[in-house]
């Protein structure tokens, strides 16, 4: 190798200056005794190199690029060799930003996968390889004192979420959780969450069903629907409140919300609806009165209200 480039820093803040030096060894005898060293950033020749001969006979050229405005570029030093440019050495330059503080960190406990899933927003593009690590520890109190550290959770490339498996969790005990972002220009940390995994539990919704008509029960009145639901068994012992939503299948009507309903109701008569109309219904539940996340809405149930009221009357709810 005849030439060697060294740079003040291969990775800088976007727009910052960068200084580079290219040294050509004396024993490259096939070169001119006084070769002119040229600089190129990407495909563009860069003026402003200051060249000098050092005491040991080597040639050095120093260039300062006042603003590196490319997020990635190759800087090369070269010599004119006949009619072509002979590249002696090149380095990759990167420019970008230190990571912003990750924000909107939130977690939910999935009882099906037995894991705590946390997600965050990484902030603006840094233009540099940036790693995110979900860090956590167990705490007996309100996370002021740190207990056992939990193995770092590293998301797959490009993902802004990570799952902490059950073996690293302790339910009904607080955990300190935060995200650390790191790249060549710096490190940042999100504000710390302090939570008990059970307080962010997200349940599966019940399954809506049509109520089987029983011989002794009166049929639904006009504009009423009888429905029941099957709770999600693994969450059965968790106190919950639920809500229904419904809308006519035809037309542009928005969802109407009914609730809160106790999970234990298990069946319900919904009235005040249009007669002889097909409705779409869904249900969702949340741990309550203790904290939790709403479940997703259940798969839809489609039911049709009756055309006219039966002659006899029975107790029903109005909505």
């Amino acid at each position: 190798e005849c030439g060697h480039i060294s740079v003040s820093a291969p990775i800088v803040h976007l727009g910052d200056p960068i200084t580079a030096s290219c040294i050509i060894k004396q024993n490259c005898s096939h070169l001119d005794p006084e070769p002119q060293i040229l600089w190129r950033l990407g495909a563009e020749l860069q003026p402003g190199g200051r060249q000098q001969r050092l005491s040991d006979g080597t040639q050095e050229s120093i260039i300062t690029l006042p603003h590196l405005n490319h997020t990635q570029a190759f800087l090369s030093c070269a010599l004119n060799w006949g009619n072509s440019l002979q590249i002696l050495d090149q380095v990759e330059l990167r420019a970008g930003y230190p990571p912003a503080i990750p924000h909107n960190l939130s977690c939910l406990m999935n009882l099906t996968t037995s894991s705590l899933i946390c997600q965050w927003e990484p902030g603006p593009e840094t233009h540099l390889p940036t790693s995110f690590t979900l860090k956590s520890f167990k705490s007996r109190g309100n996370c002021q004192t740190q207990g056992d550290s939990i193995l770092d959770c590293v998301p797959k490339d490009g993902q802004s979420h990570c799952s902490i498996p059950r073996k690293h969790l302790l339910l009904y005990q607080n955990m300190g959780i935060w995200v650390q972002a790191e790249n060549a220009l710096g490190t940042s940390m999100s504000p710390q969450l302090c939570l008990d995994p059970m307080d962010v539990v997200k349940l599966e919704p019940p399954m809506l069903r049509t109520m089987d008509p029983s011989p002794e029960a009166a049929p639904p009145q006009a504009g009423c629907l009888q429905l029941s639901w099957e709770p999600w068994q693994p969450g059965l012992h968790i106190n919950q409140k639920c809500e229904l939503r419904h809308k006519p299948q035809r037309g542009e009507a928005s969802w109407a919300l009914v609730g809160p309903l106790p999970l234990e109701a298990l069946q319900y008569e919904l009235c005040g609806l249009l007669p002889a109309t097909a409705y779409t219904l869904q249900i969702r539940c949340i741990r309550w009165p203790l904290p939790g996340h709403w479940s997703d809405w259940s798969p839809s149930l489609e039911l049709r209200t009756t055309e006219r009221a039966p002659t006899h009357h029975h107790h029903h709810h109005h909505h």
Partner: antibody
Framework: EVQLLESGGGLVQPGGSLRLSCAAS????????MGWVRQAPGKGLEWVSS????????PYADSVKGRFTISRDNSKNTLYLQMNSLRAEDTAVYYC???????????WGQGTLVTVSS | DIQMTQSPSSLSASVGDRVTITCRAS??????LNWYQQKPGKAPKLLIY???NLQNGVPSRFSGSGSGTDFTLTISSLQPEDFATYYC?????????FGGGTKVEIK
Amino acid sequence: EVQLLESGGGLVQPGGSLRLSCAASGFTFSLYWMGWVRQAPGKGLEWVSSISSSGGVTPYADSVKGRFTISRDNSKNTLYLQMNSLRAEDTAVYYCAKLGELGWFDPWGQGTLVTVSS
Amino acid sequence: DIQMTQSPSSLSASVGDRVTITCRASQGISSYLNWYQQKPGKAPKLLIYYASNLQNGVPSRFSGSGSGTDFTLTISSLQPEDFATYYCQQSYSYPQKFGGGTKVEIK
């Protein structure tokens, strides 16, 4: 401190009835599922029945379905097990227990012995 | 119904031994597996809930692992007070079932 105290056990003839009670203290009784578990002499544990916090859901083991009824009185912090048509195989120590949110039993009462014999 | 099979039904061990008890569910139960200890003439006591969570006040020599269908209770160094019968229980769905029990005896 959470405490559960069963009562009502004793000797009863086959076909007879008995009502077990479990008095709870030290926690908000109305917020928790409760359950009964029994243990025949020298045998393992057998779940009998559970009841939801407000009493609306009451699953039973097949072996007692139609004969036993679980109930609760949240105003008295008391759990009950009404046992009818008793059989010799119902002879056991009956424990009442508080259920955790993910279905575990903790704590347990000290147990009450039910003996069905002629 | 989900059946719970516990093994071994009994074992002999010495103080200081590492003891492992297994529990197998007839179908997947996620992490809904609890472990209890019972001493003669006493009510059962909860050791581990949700497969691996140590109940408050239970010594750290007890640990639980597994998910799906296969679960393990481990006592890392058996102490004199640990000689008892151990039961697993599934709480994934009704009817809730207990394993047949494992009696840990002094060798």
